[in-house]
Each structure stands twice: as C-alpha cells, then as structure tokens.
Interface confidence: medium
C-alpha cells in the first residue's frame, strides 16, 4: 500500500521592491505555484492556525513599518524608524484574515521608498485544522 | 477518493500575566482546542521531535528568565536582566519533557512581576515521529 | 480505520566543534535517525520547499561566517566579525542544493577555530512538495 502523501501546505513568498508613505508595500508573488494568494495587496488567509512569518528588506530611507492581519488588532510586526528588517515571528491567523503592510516615512518626500531584498514569507504550521477555500 | 487529512499537529499557545520571583510564570492556555496540555504550570511534551518556540512578553520590572525542558539540561532560552523578550528558537524535545519557566528578579520586592503580552508558543515540527499519549 | 500517519519530515540537526579558516565548519550528525544526510561536509537537500534554519555557536576567536546553499547565490546567513551566532531564518531550497559553511578569520593563526554549542538545524516546511531521493 502506498503511504499517504501530504496535501500541500499553505505557504507563500511575496516580494516587494517599493513601499508608499502612509500606505503599504507593493507585493508580488513571483511563483505561480504558491498555495496562498495575493489580493488587493494583501495575503489572504484561508486556514486557521499558527503561521511562521519571515520578513526581510533594506529600505532607501528611514521608515516605520507594521504588518497587520486584522482591523482593530495589533500588528504582527512593528518596527519604528528603521532602514532594514530581518525578523521572524509566529502568529495565530484565521480564515478571513488578510496580511498587509502599513508604512510611514518621516521625510516630506512624495517619492516611493525603494526596497532591496524585500521578502515576506508565510508558512502554515497547523495542517489538518480548519480551512475555507 | 478523499485525500488524506493531516492528523492535528501538536501545538499550543499559553499566556502568562504574572511571574513570581525564584519560581516561574503562571501559564494558562486560552483555548480548549490545544493539542498539547498544561500540567503543574508546565507544558507536557508527548511527541519527540523539533519544536518551534516563540516567547514574548513585557515585564513590570527587570528580571532574569529561563525556559527549561528537562532537569539537568541547559535552558531553551536564557535572558539576563531584561524587561522584555521577543525570541524565536528551535529545540529538540522528547516524550516526558516538560517546558517551564524559572524567574529571578533583582529587587527585594515580594510582589509578583506583572507581564504584558506574555505568550509562549510551541509547535511540533516532526509529525510522523514517536508520540506517547 | 487507523488515521493516516505522516511520512517523516525532512529534518536534520548537525553539530560542529571546529571550523577552519578559509574553509568551513566540520559538521557531524549525532543521530543515525536523521531524515537528511551529510555528504562532503554539506547537508544534502532532496526536497523542494521552505526550510526553517537555526544556527548557533560560540567561537574561540572572531570570525566571519556564511552559510551557503548554491554556487553563485547569496548566503542563507552572513555574519561578519562575530564571536557567536544565534540566528533563525527561513529560506526556499531545492533538490540538488547543498548547505555548507564558509569561514574567514582575521587572525594570522594557522589553528582551527574551536566552537562551543555549534549546532545547525534544518526542518522542511513543505511536505507534499517535490522530493528526489
């Protein structure tokens, strides 16, 4: 008898090369094979459970950056007046959550913030839990 | 044929709002659905394997905090004279291990240490390995 | 009916007690039960997907250390002029990749660098994806 295979794990890697003041970072998913989707510049959460979250990037100017998942809830990450980020976290997310950036710069420039190596990875840690597709 | 489902992954999130000098932090599991259990202020390990461990908290006073898993073994985390913690680690734990805190404060106060956002998450990374329930 | 078991997750913990200047760190796998293998001082990647990577160690002298996975690609970790490391990261690795160290010391000593608590852990996060054995 063939041993059972794992169904694909919900995971995604998105990249971002620019962020906008008082908005967020423009995210794109380089792979067509991701098991999670980007919609309206947010990563859509379909499955309840813990997620491993990795966030990296080098910014062209000092900024404050937060990563949110639900209106009215505190951020997953919050970094104040940084020019780079390289952070790992674990958070419990649920169906209907949306993971998105908020960015504030401290300059008066109207220019985009350029980002080198901007990468956000989410990996579901509780396969077998509730999912809604 | 229905694809096989994942059996639930061993994971738990416990919260702590206070710690006691020369003892530990009082942990509670806010969810009834956790796949791991708290007993005698410790998280009980039933399954061998690597665990992803996330530890967060803001303390009302400076303290030294260690997270242990087995008598006679070094700590999973050890932080000296801190007022906050936000750490991620990976460790190999095994059946019969128990994850618990040890705390020392450097004040002569008899009061508990209050904790904001105190959270400890454990997520098993090796489903399919040995478990004893 | 017996619920399906998980096939073993690809994971490994290797230890290293010494590193050589302008070469790497001598890695050994203490367990015979690892699901990943060491070959020519590298960890062999058989399965595509995200990996959780934990790297720890205390070095007998200051060094610069990088952890590579593929010729011509940037490092998974790069630490300059450090005497210790305690880092966690997430990276996408693929079949045929090999994870190995490169070390440079800034002394003229011909001696090996001694390492305390040198440990590298890799844990596959996408079971169900492509593997080649």
């Amino acid at each position: 008898q063939v041993p059972p295979q794992y169904p694909p794990i919900q995971s995604i890697r998105v990249q971002f090369t620019r962020c906008e003041n008082e908005k967020g970072c423009i995210i794109t998913s380089p792979s067509k094979d991701e098991t999670m989707k980007v919609q309206d510049n947010s990563i859509i959460i379909n499955c309840d459970g813990f997620y491993l979250i990795s966030l990296k990037g080098y910014f062209s100017e000092e900024l404050s950056l937060s990563l949110y998942y639900r209106k009215g809830r505190g951020p997953l990450f919050s970094l104040s007046k940084v020019t780079s980020v390289d952070s790992i976290g674990v958070a419990y997310l649920a169906f209907k959550d949306k993971v998105y950036f908020n960015v504030t710069t401290h300059s008066t420039s109207y220019k985009d913030i350029q980002v080198n190596g901007g990468e956000l990875i989410l990996i579901h840690q509780n396969p077998g839990g509730f999912c809604a597709y | 044929q229905v694809p096989p489902q994942y059996p639930p992954i061993q994971s738990i999130r416990v919260q702590f709002t206070r710690c006691e000098n020369e003892k530990g932090c009082i942990i509670t599991s806010p969810s009834k659905d956790e796949t791991m259990k708290v007993q005698d202020n410790s998280i009980i390990i039933n399954c061998d394997g690597f665990y992803l461990i996330s530890l967060k908290g803001y303390f009302s006073e400076e303290l030294s905090l260690s997270l242990y898993y087995r008598k006679g073994r070094g700590p999973l985390f050890s932080l000296s004279k801190v007022t906050s913690v936000d750490s991620i680690g990976v460790a190999y734990l095994a059946f019969k291990d128990k994850v618990y805190f040890n705390v020392t404060t450097h004040s002569t106060s008899y009061k508990d240490i209050q904790v904001n956002g105190g959270e400890l998450i454990l997520i098993h990374q090796n489903p399919g390995g040995f478990c004893a329930y | 009916q017996v619920p399906p078991q998980y096939p073993p997750i690809q994971s490994i913990r290797v230890q290293f007690t010494r590193c050589e200047n302008e070469k790497g760190c001598i890695i050994t796998s203490p367990s015979k039960d690892e699901t990943m293998k060491v070959q020519d001082n590298s960890i062999i990647i058989n399965c595509d997907g995200f990996y959780l990577i934990s790297l720890k160690g205390y070095f007998s002298e200051e060094l610069s250390l990088s952890l590579y996975y593929r010729k011509g690609r940037g490092p998974l970790f790069s630490l300059s002029k450090v005497t210790s490391v305690d880092s966690i990261g997430v990276a996408y690795l693929a079949f045929k990749d090999k994870v190995y160290f490169n070390v440079t010391t800034h002394s003229t000593s011909y001696k090996d660098i001694q390492v305390n608590g040198g440990e590298l852990i890799l844990i596959h996060q996408n079971p169900g994806g492509f593997c080649a054995y």
Epitope: E20, E22, K23, N41, E61, Y110, D112, Q114, N116 | - | -
Partner: antibody, heavy 115, light 112 residues
Framework: EVQLVESGGDLVKPAGSLRLSCVAS????????MSWVRQAPEKGLQLVAG????????YYTDAVKGRFTISRDNAKNTVYLQMNSLRAEDTAIYYC????????WGQGTLVTVSS | DIVMTQTPLSLSVSPGEPASISCKAS???????????LYWFRQKPGQSPQRLIY???NRDPGVPDRFSGSGSGTDFTLRISRVEADDAGIYYC?????????FGQGTKLEIK
C-alpha cells in the same frame, strides 16, 4: 498599455488661474506617485510638482510654491494641478508623468500666460 | 540643487555610426541600496519625452539594446552603438537621488 492624457491647458492672462487634469489608465493608479513636469518654449525639463499615491505627501518646486496645488482623486484615476496667480514665466507645455522617476509621460497640454 | 551638465549640446551622426553623450553631476550621486538614480530620456521632435535608461544602465521595456548607459560618481554616459534615423531628438539625463529631481539641459542628436 499605460496611458496618461492631460487636459485643461489654455491661454490665460497674468494673475489668472487654470486647472490641469491628467487621466491615467493601464496601471493601478492608486498605487503610484504622480508628477507634473513642464517644458518652457525652447527650454529643458523642470519638475513642477509631485504627489504620493495616498495624496498625503506633496512636492513643489520653489518657483510655484504657494501658487500651485497638486491633488489626486484615486477613484477617478486622475491627478490635478491647480495653478493660481499665473505669471508669464509659467508659460510651458505641462506633462503629467507616472511616479517620481517619470517612467511614462502624457502628451502634454500647453499653458500660455500672456496679456 | 544638483546641477546636471550635458556635453555636447548637439551632435550630428551618420546612420550606423556610434554616438556618445556625457552627463556630469555637480556633486557625486551617492548610492542608495546600491542604486544610483541616474536616468536618460529622449524627446523626439513634436513628442513628449520617453524614458530610455533607469538607474544608470538598465534599459526600459522596448528600448533597443543599441542603447546603453554607464558611469558612477559624477560622470555618466549614454551610448548608441549604431545610430538609426529614428534616434533623432533631444536627449536628457536626470538625477533622482536628491530632491528635487533635476534634468540636464539636453543634447540634440541630428542624423546626417
């Protein structure tokens, strides 16, 4: 295909006002900063004003500060340049451009300030 | 403001011949994340400007590989390896590392 279409240029007397519009299509307008660049007759290019994607940060060249106002309506995919207290030296072709690095330009609209 | 000075102000080149335009900044254009925000634009007669090159040496989509950019610090160059009749127009360099974005005065390329 990215398109930027300017309108609103005209002949106007000194101290008069004009409002230029630029309608964008072919990209997610609300995600990008926008700029106005002008070119005086037989002269080079000069950045006049810029606005970030949210409309919360703006830039003006010193020569137009206090007289010109850049704004945007993301629902209408449109960026505006309100020009007051116009002077003869404001005579130019005004181009709308995408982002602060001007990766796409409109065809321009001519503003002539003369009595 | 950073002043961008182009040379020559005009040049006349036969089809198939190379052309080179220089752009000098009044101060060194620093890196930001390894990027230097130096751009080249072309304005054909009666048309709006079009960006050709971004960040010193990267061609915009649709720009032929006959066009190349190079340089660092204060000195930058646009080269056309083999000029064609359609290349006629005014070429501008511009810098975006420091506000405000400033342009060179332009170089007029005529085809003989």
């Amino acid at each position: 295909e990215v398109q930027l279409v300017e309108s609103g240029g005209d002949l106007v007397k000194p101290a008069g006002s004009l409002r230029l519009s630029c309608v964008a299509s072919g990209f997610t307008f609300s995600s990008y900063s926008m700029s106005w660049v002008r070119q005086a007759p037989e002269k080079g290019l000069q950045l006049v004003a810029g606005i970030n994607s949210a409309g919360s940060s703006t830039y003006y060249t010193d020569a137009v500060k206090g007289r010109f106002t850049i704004s945007r309506d993301n629902a209408k995919n449109t960026v505006y340049l309100q020009m007051n207290s116009l002077r003869a030296e404001d005579t130019a072709i005004y181009y709308c451009a995408k982002r602060w690095v001007f990766d796409y330009w409109g065809q321009g609209t001519l503003v002539t300030v003369s009595s | 403001d950073i002043v961008m000075t182009q040379t020559p102000l005009s040049l006349s080149v036969s089809p198939g011949e190379p052309a080179s335009i220089s752009c000098k900044a009044s101060q060194s254009l620093p890196h930001s994340l390894g990027n230097t925000y130096l751009y080249w634009f072309r304005q054909k007669p009666g048309q709006s400007p079009q960006r050709l090159i971004y960040k010193v040496s990267n061609r915009d989509p649709g720009v032929p590989d006959r066009f190349s950019g190079s340089g660092s610090g204060t000195d930058f160059t646009l080269r056309i390896s083999r000029v064609e009749a359609d290349d006629a127009g005014i070429y501008y360099c511009g810098q975006g590392i420091q506000d405000p974005f400033t342009f060179g005065q332009g170089t007029k390329l005529e085809i003989k």
